[in-house]
Interface confidence: medium
């Protein structure tokens, strides 16, 4: 009874094709497979960043794999054969692992990178990315940032820089067709004639990054004595309706104050015989139907009612 | 607009100390990202300590160890303390303040380190 054994993939190479962060993975089926002409080997692919506790494990059939990673780590990769049970009369059979790791030679020391990056997808349709300039650095030095989402058939560098000081420090970015709902990665790098400057990499989704406008046209009605309804408009833009969440402050008679969370565009609130003003104001923000994180829109402006007003209204209709 | 003095600059011999002080015109609460910069004779401006809202610092390499920044956002001021200067650090030391996508600068406030 001879053991069945099985060589590990050839050439296993990690492959950045220049997408600041979304590498290949690749290799070539193992020296020796005819034996197993019958068989179709599989491969567990393992890799993760450097520094992470935990491998992210793969079983496929090809002779590739594409993932995202972060570029300010190195990255490793080990890979071995596998052999269905199917193949080898009752036991699956794997090799031994070929491995591999890829990082970019960091220039610079850390401190030169940019410090306080801050990307915000301002109502779902302007991307605007803002840092400031890393510490040790000399005011020649300029930073550029590199852009790439799937769609792309490269990196693209920033067209509209945001200065001030005669650095840039932010970038406009132009109208990003089929970007959200997609790893977005970015890099800015710098240049200076006195010192090497650290790159910084950076990924996310747009959706997660939203800020919508404030809500519009808050209106106020009695619907009974003691009721009375809020309503609101969705800002314009192209956030659909159902993916906000609302909050809304209610004051009155200037004391009591009441936050709330709704998901659509009223609010019915129950007064007592003692008030005598309300004021309200509204924010919105993308909910968690449709991303996985946002951030809170401004406050709408303040909108008040004298709720003798608001009842004679209701008692004339 | 924010306006900001610095202060507490001199002529200091090497080893010595100096604590720079940075007011600012209207509150820094706001403001996340202070920083301290120099430039010394014909040389460019260089960044060479930032502190942010939380209390986060980072600091050149040339100043690490000796240097020191804080800020009381109730006092509206930034600080620097220097310790164990040395010749290197004659400069001009200037106060920045980074509210949003502006930049503040103030006049600076000359320190000498010399025997």
């Known amino acids: 009874d001879t053991e069945i054994k099985v060589n590990p993939p050839q050439d296993f190479e990690i492959v950045d094709p220049g997408y600041l962060g979304y590498l290949y993975l690749q290799w070539q089926p193992p020296l020796s497979l005819d034996n197993f002409k019958e068989c179709t080997v599989e491969y567990e692919l393992k890799y993760r960043n450097i520094g992470s506790e935990t491998w992210t494990t793969i079983i496929t059939k090809n002779l590739h794999y594409k993932d995202g990673f972060d570029l300010n780590k190195g990255i490793e990769a080990k890979i071995h054969t596998l052999l269905p049970w199917q193949c080898t009369n009752g036991s699956e059979v794997q090799s031994s692992w070929a491995e591999a790791t890829y990082w970019i030679s960091p220039q610079g020391i850390p401190e030169t990178k940019v410090q306080d990056m801050d990307c915000v997808y301002y109502n779902w349709q302007y991307l605007l990315c803002s840092w400031k300039p890393g510490i040790g650095v000399l005011l020649d030095t300029n930073y550029n940032l590199f852009y790439w989402y799937e769609g792309l058939d490269r990196a693209l560098q920033c067209v509209d820089y945001i200065k001030v000081d005669g650095q840039n420090i932010g970038c406009r970015f132009p109208y990003l067709e089929s970007s959200d709902y997609k790893d977005f990665y970015i890099c800015v790098n710098g240049s200076s004639e006195t010192k090497p400057i650290r790159s910084s990499y950076f990924t996310f989704q747009l959706q997660n990054i939203v800020k919508p406008l404030p809500p519009v046209c808050l209106t106020c009605t009695q619907e009974s004595l003691y009721e009375i309804k809020l309503k609101w408009s969705i800002p314009l833009g192209p956030i659909p309706a159902r993916c906000f969440v609302y909050e809304i402050e209610i004051r009155e008679d200037d004391t009591t104050l009441v936050t709330t969370t709704v998901e659509n565009e009223t609010y019915t609130l129950k007064i007592t015989n003692e008030t005598r003003q309300l004021c309200f104001v509204v924010r919105s923000k993308v909910n968690i139907y449709c991303s996985d994180d946002g951030i809170w829109s401004e406050w709408s402006d303040k909108q008040c009612w004298e709720v003798e007003e608001l009842l004679k209204k209701t008692l004339l209709l | 607009q924010v306006q900001l003095q610095e202060s507490g600059g001199g002529l200091v011999q090497p080893g010595g100390s100096l604590r720079l002080s940075c007011t600012a015109s209207?509150?820094?609460?706001?403001?996340?990202?202070m920083a301290w910069g120099r430039q010394g004779p014909g040389k460019p401006r260089e960044l060479i300590a930032t502190?942010?809202?939380?209390?986060?610092?980072n600091y050149a390499e040339s100043v690490k160890g000796r240097f020191t920044v804080s800020r009381d956002n109730a006092e509206n001021t930034l600080y620097l303390q220097m310790n164990n200067l040395k010749s290197e650090d004659t400069a001009v030391y200037y106060c920045n303040a980074r509210p949003g996508l502006q930049s503040y600068w103030g006049q600076g406030t000359q320190v000498t380190v010399s025997s």
């Open positions: 209207g509150s820094i609460r706001g403001i996340g990202y």
């Open positions: 502190i942010n809202s939380a209390g986060d610092t």
